[in-house]
């Protein structure tokens, strides 16, 4: 369960892939589309509001009792819109929604390195936001093999 309803912290950051492509958001036909693209040098990067929440890992699963805390994030590129996992379509979508946010809007934050992060679906452990064909998609990761897979690595820059 997520501890409390308010985030422990928030930050504005631009999101880019491991290969330094930018994640951008465009309003098209009254809905937002998400793109992964090389930005022209003079173009400003889109910012995302990351809200960080503390989540207690169920002790029955972890064996840790109350010790197993995770950090979850929601990502909002514009007011009232949040990234959400669509597990049926294996897609990442932007939806307008009100708080409390649905579980599909929460992602477990992984620090793969000091400057790279990954986002794991709260609703589908082992499934991460990744890059596929210049779009964001949900990618199933085999923990024993592909934990460092570049297509699920992202950089946050303030």
């Amino acid at each position: 369960s997520i501890t409390g309803i308010s985030p422990i912290t928030e930050s504005l950051a631009s999101l880019s892939t491991y290969n330094d492509q930018s994640i951008t958001f465009a309003l098209e036909d009254e809905s937002y589309e998400i793109y992964v693209e090389d930005l022209k040098k003079d173009k400003k990067k889109d910012k995302v509001l990351l809200s960080y929440y503390e989540s207690q890992h169920p002790s029955s699963e972890s064996g840790d009792g109350v010790d197993g805390k995770m950090l979850m994030v929601t990502l909002s590129p514009t007011k009232d819109f949040w990234l959400q996992a669509n597990n049926k379509e294996h897609s990442v979508e932007l939806h307008k929604c009100e708080k409390p946010l649905p579980d599909q809007a929460f992602f477990v934050l992984h620090n793969r390195s000091f400057n790279c992060v990954s986002f794991e679906c709260k609703t589908d452990p082992g499934v991460f936001i990744g890059v596929k064909d210049n779009h964001l998609a949900l990618i199933k990761v085999d923990y024993s093999e592909n934990l460092g897979s570049e297509n699920i690595l992202f950089k946050l820059s303030e």
Partner: antibody, heavy 122, light 107 residues
Framework: EVQLVESGGGLVQPGGSLRLSCAAS????????MTWIRQAPGKGLEWVAS????????YYPDSVKGRFTISRDDAKSSLYLQMNSLRAEDTAVYYC???????????????WGQGTLVTVSS | DIQMTQSPSSLSASVGDRVTITCLAS??????LAWYQQKPGKSPKLLIY???RLQDGVPSRFSGSGSGTDFTLTISSLQPEDFATYFC?????????FGGGTKVEIK
């Protein structure tokens, strides 16, 4: 109960080597970043090394880079610090610490071992 | 590297006093700022993380605040067991760095 127990400290001559160990228990070891922090006698705290929860990344300050190596053995729930080319200024109590959250570096270090003293002197 | 400058380096106070310790960073960062308490011969103990969140089991007389470059640890009513050395630590940028410490002594 989370426990971190360091061992391997002792007296070593300048230029010598030492390997510190940290035995972890009471938590799922392979879900956490682990870090070594040291404290010279009567001085402040200094970060020494960190390792990712996967073991795939290791990080050091310039003061120990190239001389110290952090590693982990998840099967044994153990953390290690191999210290080579030791200098007098490496004399300190070395603490093994655990991150606050699964998979993450955020939030400080809620768990510390009791520390093990390394003395570098001729 | 981010330098963390703690002030004062030492202070004398009485039981019941309100005590404030500050930590000034050489450059701004997100709020990954922790405060630790250390007693002689003991390991440091995490009091506050994320600049203002109280670690489990820490008395509510301890509080943290601040953002950017200025952070503060406050003890609202000093207790006998609070006489110790306090350190701040930033975790936002590597290398991780600590403040030099503030020793809180009995007046």
């Amino acid at each position: 109960e989370v426990q971190l127990v360091e061992s391997g400290g002792g007296l070593v001559q300048p230029g010598g080597s030492l390997r510190l160990s940290c035995a972890a228990s009471g938590f799922t070891f392979n879900n956490y970043w682990m870090t070594w922090i040291r404290q010279a006698p009567g001085k402040g705290l200094e970060w020494v090394a960190s390792i990712t929860y996967t073991g795939g990344g290791t990080y050091y300050p310039d003061s120990v880079k190239g001389r110290f190596t952090i590693s982990r053995d998840d099967a044994k729930s153990s953390l290690y610090l191999q210290m080579n080319s030791l200098r007098a200024e490496d004399t300190a109590v070395y603490y093994c610490t655990r991150a606050n959250y699964y998979y993450n570096t955020y939030g400080g270090f809620p768990y510390w071992g009791q520390g093990t003293l390394v003395t570098v002197s001729s | 590297d981010i330098q963390m400058t703690q002030s004062p380096s030492s202070l004398s106070a009485s039981v019941g006093d309100r005590v404030t310790i500050t930590c000034l960073a050489s450059e701004g960062f997100s709020n990954d700022l922790a405060w630790y308490q250390q007693k002689p011969g003991k390991s440091p103990k995490l009091l506050i993380y994320a600049a203002s969140r109280l670690q489990d089991g820490v008395p509510s007389r301890f509080s943290g605040s601040g953002s950017g470059t200025d952070f503060t640890l406050t003890i609202s009513s000093l207790q006998p067991e609070d006489f110790a050395t306090y350190f701040c630590q930033q975790g936002s940028k590597y290398p991780l760095t600590f403040g030099g410490g503030t020793k809180v002594e009995i007046k």
